[in-house]
Interface confidence: medium
């Protein structure tokens, strides 16, 4: 054998953000001819020796970190990247607003603000069509998302979620959508 067994990929379909009681499928994908897959939920004793886990109705207890690996002969692969499966709709939706407003000139600045009645300390902002959170993939400790030097690429529909660092995989319902409209043409860089 010339190298370690490459790590498989683990994905959630249709998304890793799953509303409570909605279905989701976790799929572990390794090279062809794998002998055995192991898919497990971290920090629990829950695992299965299959590549696909179908969850017909998302529950709070199923939210968390998952990863998978596979076995060929007596060798185990390196583990997949961890997948964070988030249950949404656990708490009431926050409100999302734009300051100074949802219509902004190209080259201007705008701040998207996520507000909640609860004492949540973390917030995530998503732009429709983008699988990853907007801007910085780390957690945010402020409810404000400044967008400096807006371009046409920033226009679109945004939603935010709020949650607590004590239960990082139990999120609110998404805010109502906010349509960010960018007017004018992009400034030519000097």
């Amino acid at each position: 054998q010339s190298g370690p067994l490459p790590k498989p990929s683990l994905q959630a379909l249709p998304s890793s953000l799953v509303p409570l009681e909605k279905p989701v499928t976790l799929r572990c994908q390794g090279p062809p001819g794998v002998d055995l897959y192991r898919l497990e939920k971290l920090s629990s004793s829950r695992y299965q020796d299959q590549a696909v886990l179908f969850i017909p109705a998302m529950k709070r207890s199923l939210a968390g970190r998952y990863r998978c690996s596979y076995q060929n002969g007596s060798l185990w692969s390196l583990p997949s990247d961890q997948l964070e499966l988030v249950a949404t709709g656990v708490f009431a939706k926050p409100s999302l607003s734009a300051q100074p407003g949802p219509a902004v000139s190209s080259g201007g600045d705008v701040t998207l603000q996520c507000q909640t009645r609860y004492g949540f300390d973390q917030f995530a902002l998503y732009k429709e069509g983008d699988p990853a959170p907007y801007k910085n993939p780390e957690r945010w400790y402020r409810a404000s998302f400044p967008i400096i030097t807006v371009t046409a690429a920033h226009s679109g529909t945004y939603r935010c979620y709020s949650f607590s660092s004590r239960d990082p995989y139990l999120w609110s319902a998404p805010s109502d959508p906010l349509e960010l409209v960018v007017t004018g043409t992009d400034p030519i860089p000097e």
Epitope: L42, S45, S69, L78, P79, A132, N136, P137, E138
Partner: antibody, heavy 114, light 106 residues
Framework: QVQLQESGPGLVAPSQSLSITCTVS????????VNWVRQPPSRGLEWLGM???????DYQSTLKSRLSISKDNSKSQVFLKMNSLTTDDTARYYC????????WGQGTSVTVSS | DIQMTQSPSSLSASVGGRVTITCKAS??????IAWYQHKPGKGPSLLIH???TLQPGVPSRFSGSGSGRDYSFSISNLQPEDIATYYC????????FGGGTKLEIK
């Protein structure tokens, strides 16, 4: 082939910040995570934190408040920043690839002293 | 956080002999343990991951076993080049190293 190379300041004054860069080759930072590990003089290895391929981060709980890990995928560089240094932060700092850290750099020595 | 208790902290053995190092986790780590060899002036080298899977190029003199909270690592037919410090690492939940075992040859 897979390589990781750390570069740091060598000497840092107490209460100042430490910045170290890990430059990688032979693999993509979008597909693999990078860890930071340190070894104080005559002590064992200590895991500091990790940045995953998707950019999310994990930190050792005792250092979380003063540690930040970021990266530039296009430059194949990962950055460690640690604030409020004390002499206890004197160590050799290593970057290592993914889980369970199959490739390591040679490390860069950091001394915290006035 | 998961703690890893590694023992012994040092040991001495003869060329051709066998040594065993143990690591005990503070909770079940589901076989997610790796073993490293660390020599002065170099970065550590991964020998074994997922309890017992040898990295390519690592001699079969090195082996690992265990489950739940208890794990062990052995070197048989000890060679002079095996002089190093050995560490266990759990990667079930975040990452934690054991305290290390310094191996010397008699």
């Amino acid at each position: 082939q897979v390589q990781l190379q750390e570069s740091g300041p060598g000497l840092v004054a107490p209460s100042q910040s430490l910045s170290i860069t890990c430059t990688v080759s032979g693999f993509s930072l979008t597909g693999y995570g990078v860890n930071w590990v340190r070894q104080p003089p005559s002590r064992g290895l200590e895991w500091l934190g990790m940045i995953w391929g998707d950019g999310s981060t994990d930190y050792q709980s005792t250092l979380k408040s003063r540690l930040s890990i970021s990266k530039d995928n296009s430059k194949s560089q990962v950055f460690l920043k640690m604030n409020s240094l004390t002499t206890d932060d004197t160590a050799r700092y290593y970057c290592a690839r993914d889980l369970p850290m199959d490739y390591w750099g040679q490390g860069t020595s950091v001394t915290v002293s006035s | 956080d998961i703690q890893m208790t590694q023992s012994p902290s040092s040991l001495s053995a003869s060329v051709g002999g066998r040594v065993t190092i143990t690591c005990k986790a503070s909770q079940d780590i589901n076989k997610y343990i790796a073993w490293y060899q660390h020599k002065p002036g170099k970065g550590p080298s991964l020998l074994i991951h997922y309890t017992s899977t040898l990295q390519p190029g690592v001699p079969s003199r090195f082996s690992g076993s265990g489950s739940g909270r208890d794990y062990s690592f052995s070197i048989s037919n000890l060679q002079p080049e095996d002089i190093a410090t050995y560490y266990c690492l759990q990667y079930a939940l975040l990452l934690t190293f054991g305290g290390g075992t310094k191996l010397e040859i008699k």
